[in-house]
């Protein structure tokens, strides 16, 4: 913590200006009033402070503001933002998204992805809803960022806005979160025709069911193997290889580049191999001709 | 070794079609794909397909979809690549190419098809 | 479809000298769950059918010299001679296998100064 000492009365502030970056840690603690930054915080971004001075700065907020600072504050943070933990975020409420924009732009290049994170959720909370603004802001300001929300927060998102979505907004995706984003998906897109239909589908895949998955394989998609990679494991494991020869078209010739990767070797694994043999590829690892497959998990469901 | 022996240069005239031949060797010819890709004269090149030669299945380009045929016969380990209806532009370098997984381990020597009247 | 820029069209560098040779997609070659990138880059000696040097963007072909080298991921990839012999003026191309159909580059003609 800085030292308390009171300041002398030449180095008084009234204003936020340059000549506070001569002010040692101590003088700056002394003799800037909190309130002066706060309703000047627009000037602080201006001003070449050292990162010394600007834990300052924020200290000097944190006690003005112990239960988190007020949106008009939080949109001048500038580079004061690079001092800011996910727990300094989380106390906040931001519902303006030119503040959203203000802030990504600042981190823009730093390792902040905690800290993104937390402001994207603040921003969603304070707006009740993950509109096609709040989306729209996200894509362009911070592409990928739209994956560091939870499952939770991504239920809140309404249909009609994941046609602003773009494939490489979902790349970080995880499993839960495309859960939630595939059925909404699904309803968005239910309207257009089957090659139309394949491509803005795509990228939301990972949260498909199997249904779906044997579905699509009966439509010609070619399906690449990148995106067949990222199906759940559950989908893909109860497909037939003539199912998957169907879903992947010429793109079944990657099965043998990446069959030491799931959920390739998986699905391989409960393969007949005669079946796998038709797919031209020497891929191995399937059940030998004769060997009787038996379900226990069945078994275990009824006893 | 693998090797790939392409049938020898053809002249036809527009509007025909012409049958290249892609002999395989050196290794089991059913357990990798083999695709075709041509070259025109001083240009850079284009895939046209490619070819399960364990089920027969064939995949094209769709600029070559209404014109070409993919084809093999398993017991003299062949691929036959048929392109129809030929017109000048189709004037070009045709290569067989073994698949390496996605990539195209193996080429072969390339069949010249000259289209003129 | 992908398309895939080559940089430059033409290169002379001299013997013993470095080459390097740049491919950009129009979309992203990266397969996130294996970490593959589905770029190969094939060498086209004067009146030869071309042959493969590398594939996944940085696998080398067996018996391919260990100057040829390859490089980047995504969308923006790098060949590189890093020390030019006589026998490799050619034209380089590079080839994305990610989706068809499966498209290649334009070509670069590496040439000696």
């Known amino acids: 913590d800085v030292e308390r000492t009171t300041c002398p009365p030449e180095k008084e502030v009234h204003e936020i200006d340059e000549s506070l970056i001569f002010y040692k840690k101590r003088e700056l603690e002394a003799c800037v009033d909190a309130a002066l930054l706060a309703a000047q915080m627009d000037r602080v971004d201006a001003i070449p402070f050292t990162y010394e001075q600007l834990d300052v700065l924020k200290h000097k907020l944190d006690e003005l503001y112990p239960q988190g600072y007020p949106e008009s504050v939080i949109r001048h943070l500038g580079h004061l933002f690079l001092k800011m933990s996910p727990e300094d975020i989380r106390k906040w409420n931001v519902t303006s998204l030119e503040t959203l924009k203000a802030l990504l732009k600042v981190s823009k290049g730093h390792e902040m992805s905690a800290q993104v994170a937390t402001l994207i959720d603040r921003v969603v909370v304070g707006r009740g809803q993950l509109d096609k603004d709040t989306v729209d802001t996200l894509t362009a300001f911070c592409p990928g960022c739209l994956c560091s929300l939870s499952p939770e927060r991504l239920s809140s998102v309404p249909p009609s806005v994941i046609g602003a979505v773009r494939p490489q907004d979902l790349d970080t995706c995880g499993p839960r979160q495309l859960d939630v984003l595939y059925p909404k998906a699904r309803l968005a897109f239910q309207n257009m025709s089957g090659s139309e239909y394949f491509v803005k589908i795509r990228p939301f895949l990972g949260g498909a069911p199997t249904e779906d998955v044997k579905a699509l394989s009966q439509q010609n998609v070619s399906m690449d193997l990148a995106t067949f990679m990222k199906l759940r494991r559950e989908a893909v494991l109860p497909l037939t290889v003539a199912e998957v020869q169907k879903l992947l078209g010429p793109h079944v010739e990657g099965l043998k580049v990446e069959e030491q990767h799931s959920p390739v070797r998986d699905w391989i694994l409960k393969q007949r191999q005669d079946d796998l043999d038709t797919l031209g590829l020497g891929l191995q690892g399937g059940i030998p001709n004769g060997y009787l497959i038996l379900d226990l998990s069945v078994r275990e469901a009824l006893s | 070794e693998v090797q790939l022996v392409q049938s020898g240069a053809e002249v036809k005239k527009p509007g025909a079609s012409v049958k290249v031949s892609c002999k395989a060797s050196?290794?089991?010819?059913?357990?990798?794909?083999m695709h075709w890709v041509r070259q025109a004269p001083g240009q850079g090149l284009e895939w046209m397909g490619n070819?399960?030669?364990?089920?027969?299945?064939?995949y094209y380009n769709e600029r070559f979809m209404s014109r070409v045929t993919m084809t093999v016969d398993k017991s003299t380990s062949t691929a036959y690549m048929e392109l129809s209806s030929l017109r000048s532009e189709d004037t070009a370098v045709y290569y067989c190419?073994?698949?390496?997984?996605?990539?195209?381990?193996?080429w072969g020597q390339g069949t010249l098809v000259t289209v003129s009247s | 479809d992908i398309v895939m820029t080559q940089s430059p069209d033409s290169l002379a560098v001299s013997l013993g000298e470095r080459a390097t040779i740049n491919c950009k997609s129009s979309q992203t070659l990266l397969n996130s769950v294996s970490q593959n990138n589905y770029l190969a880059w094939y060498q086209q000696k004067p009146g030869q059918s071309p042959t493969l040097l590398i594939y996944f963007a940085s696998t080398r072909e067996s018996g391919v010299p260990d100057r040829f080298s390859g490089s980047g991921s995504g969308t923006d990839f790098t060949l590189t001679i890093s020390s030019l012999q006589a026998e490799d003026v050619a034209v380089y191309y590079c080839?994305?296998?990610?989706?068809?159909?499966?498209?290649f580059g334009g070509g670069t003609k590496v040439e000696i100064k």
């Open positions: 080839q994305q296998h990610y989706r068809t159909p499966y498209t």
């Open positions: 190419a073994r698949s390496g997984g996605l990539w195209l381990a193996f």
């Open positions: 050196g290794y089991t010819f059913t357990n990798y794909w």
């Open positions: 070819i399960n030669p364990s089920s027969g299945d064939s």
